[in-house]
Structure formats: structure tokens, C-alpha cells
């Protein structure tokens, strides 16, 4: 039979520059010699001949004089390979391969890592700051391998996700350097974080930023918007109401106006220097321009959706700035539900019946009550689903089992918490002969 | 380190156009505005415009809308501007200048001299 | 537009003398005001941002105040290198201006 050779499963893991060993065993009969050997290394994919051992001799290394065996250790099995100063390029399958008078091979995976340096954030521009101004934050790591992930987040640790790019260049040796840009609005002040992982070292490298855009003296701009969530039915519009008082000979010029989402500082709609930049969100969103200079600063959303749920940031920056948060709770009414009854024939006092109760397209999910026809809850052995669909909105299927009496009457209550709204079905069982669905 | 490299002194006739260069390095192109600025012999300062790097997004000078077409070819990290039906009053030192509110790096400027 | 009234428009000083230069704005700005410092043949350079703020590697004896529509840039002691012509500008609003220029010039 085959000789067997034996090699780690995982891949082994190689700093650049340190040594690694690539083990590799197979267990010698009694009376073996090393003049009845024949071992070779060779990079897997290509064949090329790493290091081998035939004849009772050290044949040396085929490759840049980085390989070496363990000559102590071959007589009782072990073929493992010494590989120095190990490289980028040295990442890969090398193949061991081991004859006496059978013969057999093993693949061993050898992963190459560099860690990455400290991250070194640069800001631009970095001086005369306002609120409401662009600015560019660039995030540099060096001679780090594999390429890295890069993750930015604000202070509250929230991942920042919109407007970054990242580029990854390999150097002659093969390490990476990474330089990640974040282009982000200022608000009032806000830290940046910048992490730069290691996927192979499982290695975090981070830094962080904080800016403080200038103040003015003559105080911060009152910003005022509802205190209560604003509710918006899914496909209509909503109108986020957002102020700012004015002061005397106030030109939309001086005005820097910007909504973003609260959590991920994404931009979504933006007014600077007398113009309306536009929608950012989708092409769904627009101001009232013929009332900000009134001091109308309110954004209206159109075709709403369940994503658009949250809090929206609005900001307002004049000479200086305020800012202050509206949420938007978006809802959906539930469908009147309609009621199946199993079994729904020949049934009599006593049988266990499954009543299904489903109504569908409604958000957020869905508060399911049963009672029976005296209006008495019904709450044992009833089980309820909600299932989203692509579109956020909610199917809500409650099942309850339940022994019949001689007759009786069965309601489902499907309440909408948001809007208070509630829709309901029942079904009357009645006595012998029963068929279904029976009028409620 | 910063710099603002502009193209070379141009002589127009009346009734053409110049296109102005400005080749941007030491900094992220994209991450400043860019301004140009117009001075007459002996005169002051101004203002003609500014583009965002980052999106092409302009703003002009009034003054200015009808005769100077500002652009960027990231890729080069070079602003341009284009002067159009060139008189003589558009004889002057033209620079660019990096910036939102402050200037702080100017280019060498360039002369165009409008003669017939 | 904002309009920036500069004056001196022009004046003589000699080296050690402490000069004053003001800006008028046609409306309140707050402090988004620049100074600017040209020599002959030269672009213009970066002295003083809002209103006050030294632009790094501008000598301490450039100093600036004001808010509103009234500002100064002071030269505590004038040296040889700082004949040249002086501009303020707006930064408030768009268009950006700038003032006339003050020519200082060697007595």
C-alpha cells in the first residue's frame, strides 16, 4: 500500500521576514535507513523542485538558498521543511513528497502576513473649519499583507459607510500600503475613526480625528423640530419640519443647510451658498426653497419607504450652526384578515380545530389578539409569525387550536401599533352539519 | 509640499478663447475647491470662480458667468480655466488659488495678453 | 455683493515703524475676514485668517483684529522684507472680494 505522509489541515501562517516550518511526517518501518530514502519538496502548482534528499544525502535547496531539512529528525519520520526569511512570494501549496519503498505526498498550505503599521490620519483642509464644510480625511497604513479591511466609524462607534474609497498598492516586495479617504460634512464636532484590520492576523490598526470646527462669537443658530416622531404611511410623502429664526438682512447665501441620517452622518439633502445642492437620498427628497429664507427649513420625502425609517438630522449653519433631530416612524395598515378553518368539515363538539388568522403589508409588526364571542381573550396554544418581505412590510399569520363546544364564534384582532389601527376577522362554528367557511 | 504649477504667459487676439491651466500636487485634489482670480495690471483683486474638484460643481462671479468656463480632470489633478470672446479688458494675471474661505496656496499666475 | 473699502490705499514707512491698515466691509461679516501679502511680480500670500488667526510660518509682528465691519492689520515693526501691497477679503459671502490693496512703501 501507499506510504502514508502526513501534513497540518490549516494553512501555516508566516510573518514576512521570520522563518516558518512546513511540517511534514510519515513513520519509518523497523530497520529503515535513510539510504532507502527519497524525499522531495516542490511548490505544488507549478513543480518546481524546493528542496530534496535522496540517496542518503541532503540534495540542498533549489530555492534562492532560503530551505533546509532537519537531518537529526529524518530517520524517525520527519520531512519537515525549514523555509527562512520567508517572502510574499513564498505563499502557496508546497507538496511533500516522500519514497522508500512506496511512496505517498501531502499538500501543505503555507499563508504569508505582514502586520499593518499604525494608521496616520490626515485632514484636509485643516484649518478654517465651519460646520457644514466638506472636509477630505485620509487614512494610511503601510506595508501590511493580505490586503486589508478598512472600517471607519464616527465617536459612538457607529460605522460611517458613505463616500469612502479605498485604494490598496502593492510594493516591489509585495506588501500593501492601504490609503483609505472619508469625505464627510462637519457637524458640530465629531471624532473619526479609521480601522485597519489584518484579515489573515486578525490584527486591528486604528487611529482617530477629532475636529472642532470654528465657533463665532455671536452665538449658535436655534434650531427647532418636532419632539414627537413624525408617522409617514408607506407610499406617501412626509414633510420633516425643521426651523431656524432668521436674522434681520438674512441671504440664503450665507446659509449652509444640511439633513443627514442622524446614525450614519449619510448626506441626504444639502442647500449651501444660495443654491439647493439637491438630493443625496435617492432623488426622493426636497426642500421648500420659496420658504427658506422665512426660515422653513423642512425637507419633504417622497414615496416613503421602511428603510427610510430613523432619525434625520437637520443643520443649519449661518454664521454659526445648530442642529436638532426628527424621527420618522413609517407605518403600513394591515389587511383585513382573512380566516381558514382545519378541518373544516364534519366536525363535531370536542374535535381540536386550527383556526389561521392572516393579514398582510403592514409595519412595524403587528400586536395579534384572540377572543372569543363573548369577548373573553383567548391566549392558549396560539402561535403567531410576521414574515418581511423585500419591501419591509410585514404578513402576519397567527394560528390558534382550540377544542370546539357546541358552537361558538372565534375573532382575531391584527392591531397596528403605530397607527392604532385595527383589523379583524371571525369565524362562527356552528352545530351539525358543519361546513366552511360559515358567513361571520 | 504644495503646489500650484499654472501654464505659460498666452498672447490672444480679440474675439478668441484661452484655456488657463493649473496642475495641482502635494495634497488631495479633490479635497479642496478651486478658485481663480483675476488681476489687472497695477489693479486689485478678482474673484472669478471656483470649482469642487471632488463633483465639477461650480460657483461664479456674476461678473464673470458669461466669460469664464471653469473644469478638472481629476485624473491629472488639473483645474482649467477657459476665457472666452477675449477683449481687452481681459488682459490681466490670472491665478488659481486652493480654497474654501482661505486661500492659502496661490499659483504663479498667468499672464494673457489681449492684442490685435 | 459685499464692498471692502481699504485704506490707506497707499502709504510710506520706514523700517522699525508700526503700521495700520483697515478694512470696511458694506456688511457685517463677522469674522470671516483674510489677509493677503503681494510683492511685485509674486502671487499673493496667506497672512491672517478670521480676522485674527496667524496663517503658520507668518511672523508674529503681523497681527489682526475686528469683527463685524471693522478690521485691522497691524505690523508691530516694520522690516525690509514687508514692503508690498496689502489686501483684506471677505469670506462671508459669495462672490468672495477683496479690498483695493494698501501700497506700503519705503520712506
Known amino acids: 500500500g501507499a506510504l502514508e505522509v502526513q501534513v497540518p489541515e490549516d494553512p501555516v501562517v508566516a510573518l514576512v521576514g521570520t522563518d516558518a516550518t512546513l511540517c511534514c511526517s510519515f513513520s519509518p518501518e523497523p530497520g529503515f535507513s535513510l539510504a532507502q530514502l527519497n524525499l522531495i519538496w516542490q511548490l505544488t502548482d507549478t513543480k518546481q523542485l524546493v528542496h530534496s534528499f535522496a540517496e542518503g544525502q541532503d540534495q540542498g535547496s533549489a530555492y534562492a538558498n532560503r530551505t533546509a531539512l532537519f537531518p537529526d529528525l529524518l530517520a524517525q519520520g520527519n520531512a519537515s521543511l525549514r523555509l527562512q526569511r520567508v517572502r510574499v512570494a513564498d505563499e502557496g501549496s508546497f507538496t511533500c513528497f516522500v519514497s522508500i519503498r512506496d511512496f505517498g505526498s501531502a499538500a501543505v498550505s503555507l499563508q504569508v502576513a505582514a502586520p499593518y503599521s499604525k494608521p496616520s490620519m490626515t485632514l484636509e483642509p485643516n484649518k478654517d473649519l465651519r460646520p457644514g464644510d466638506t472636509v477630505t480625511i485620509t487614512c494610511s497604513s503601510y506595508q501590511g499583507y493580505p490586503e486589508a479591511e478598512v472600517f471607519w466609524q464616527d465617536g459612538q462607534g457607529v460605522p460611517l459607510t458613505g463616500n469612502v474609497t479605498t485604494s490598496q498598492m502593492a510594493n516591489e516586495q509585495g506588501l500593501f500600503d492601504v490609503h483609505s479617504i472619508l469625505r464627510v460634512v462637519l457637524g458640530a464636532n465629531g471624532t473619526y475613526s479609521c480601522l485597519v484590520r489584518n484579515p489573515v492576523l486578525q490584527q486591528d490598526a486604528h487611529s482617530s480625528v477629532t475636529i472642532t470646527p470654528q465657533r463665532s462669537p455671536t452665538g449658535a443658530v436655534e434650531v427647532q423640530v418636532p419632539e414627537d416622531p413624525v408617522v409617514a404611511l408607506v407610499g406617501t410623502d412626509a414633510t420633516l419640519r425643521c426651523s431656524f429664526s432668521p436674522e434681520p438682512g438674512f441671504s440664503l447665501a450665507q446659509l449652509n443647510l444640511i439633513w443627514q441620517l442622524t446614525d450614519t452622518k449619510q448626506l441626504v439633502h444639502s442647500f449651501t451658498e444660495g443654491r439647493d445642492q439637491g438630493s443625496a437620498y435617492a432623488n426622493r427628497t426636497a426642500l421648500f426653497p420659496d420658504l427658506l429664507a422665512q426660515g422653513n427649513a423642512s425637507l419633504r420625502l417622497q414615496r416613503v419607504r421602511v428603510a427610510d425609517e430613523g432619525s434625520f438630522t437637520c443643520f443649519v449653519s449661518i454664521r454659526d450652526f445648530g442642529s436638532a433631530a426628527v424621527s420618522l416612524q413609517v407605518a403600513a395598515p394591515y389587511s383585513k384578515p382573512s380566516m381558514t378553518l382545519e378541518p373544516n368539515k364534519d366536525l363535531r363538539p370536542g374535535d381540536t380545530v386550527t383556526i389561521t388568522c392572516s393579514s398582510y403589508r403592514g409595519y412595524p409588526e403587528a400586536e395579534v389578539f384572540w377572543q372569543d364571542g363573548q369577548g373573553v381573550p383567548l391566549t392558549g396554544n396560539v402561535t403567531t409569525s410576521q414574515m418581511a418581505n423585500e419591501q419591509g412590510l410585514f404578513d402576519v399569520h397567527s394560528v390558534l387550536r382550540v377544542v370546539l363546544g357546541a358552537n361558538g364564534t372565534y375573532s382575531c384582532l391584527v392591531r397596528n401599533p403605530v397607527l392604532q389601527q385595527d383589523a379583524h376577522g371571525s369565524v362562527t362554528i356552528t352545530g351539525q352539519p358543519m361546513t366552511f367557511p360559515p358567513e361571520a | 509640499e504644495v503646489q500650484l504649477v499654472q501654464s505659460g504667459a498666452e498672447v490672444k487676439k480679440p474675439g478668441s478663447s484661452v484655456k488657463v491651466s493649473c496642475k495641482a500636487s502635494?495634497?488631495?485634489?479633490?479635497?479642496?475647491?478651486m478658485n481663480w482670480v483675476k488681476q489687472r495690471p497695477g489693479q486689485g483683486l478678482e474673484w472669478i470662480g471656483r470649482?469642487?474638484?471632488?463633483?465639477?460643481?461650480?460657483r461664479y462671479n456674476q461678473n464673470f458667468r458669461d466669460k469664464a468656463r471653469l473644469t478638472v480632470d481629476k485624473s491629472s489633478s488639473t483645474a482649467y480655466m477657459e476665457l472666452s470672446s477675449l477683449r481687452s479688458e481681459d488682459t490681466a494675471v490670472y491665478y488659481c488659488?486652493?480654497?474654501?474661505?482661505?486661500?492659502?496656496?496661490w499659483g504663479q499666475g498667468t499672464t494673457v495678453t489681449v492684442s490685435s | 455683493d459685499i464692498q471692502m473699502t481699504q485704506s490707506p490705499s497707499s502709504l510710506s514707512a520706514s523700517v522699525g515703524d508700526r503700521v495700520t491698515i483697515t478694512c470696511r466691509t458694506s456688511?457685517?461679516?463677522?469674522?470671516?475676514l483674510a489677509w493677503y501679502q503681494q510683492k511685485p511680480g509674486k502671487s499673493p500670500k496667506l497672512l491672517i485668517y478670521?480676522?485674527?488667526t496667524l496663517e503658520e510660518g507668518v511672523p508674529s509682528r503681523f497681527r489682526g483684529s475686528g469683527s463685524g465691519t471693522h478690521f485691522t492689520l497691524t505690523i508691530s515693526s516694520l522690516q525690509p522684507e514687508d514692503f508690498a501691497t496689502y489686501f483684506c477679503?471677505?469670506?462671508?459671502?459669495?462672490?468672495?472680494?477683496f479690498g483695493g490693496g494698501t501700497k506700503v512703501e519705503i520712506k
Open positions: 488659488a486652493r480654497g474654501v474661505r482661505i486661500f492659502d496656496y
Open positions: 470649482i469642487d474638484p471632488y463633483d465639477s460643481e461650480t
Open positions: 502635494g495634497y488631495t485634489f479633490t479635497a479642496y475647491w
Open positions: 478670521n480676522a485674527n
Open positions: 477679503k471677505q469670506a462671508y459671502d459669495v462672490p468672495r472680494t
Open positions: 456688511e457685517n461679516i463677522d469674522y470671516t
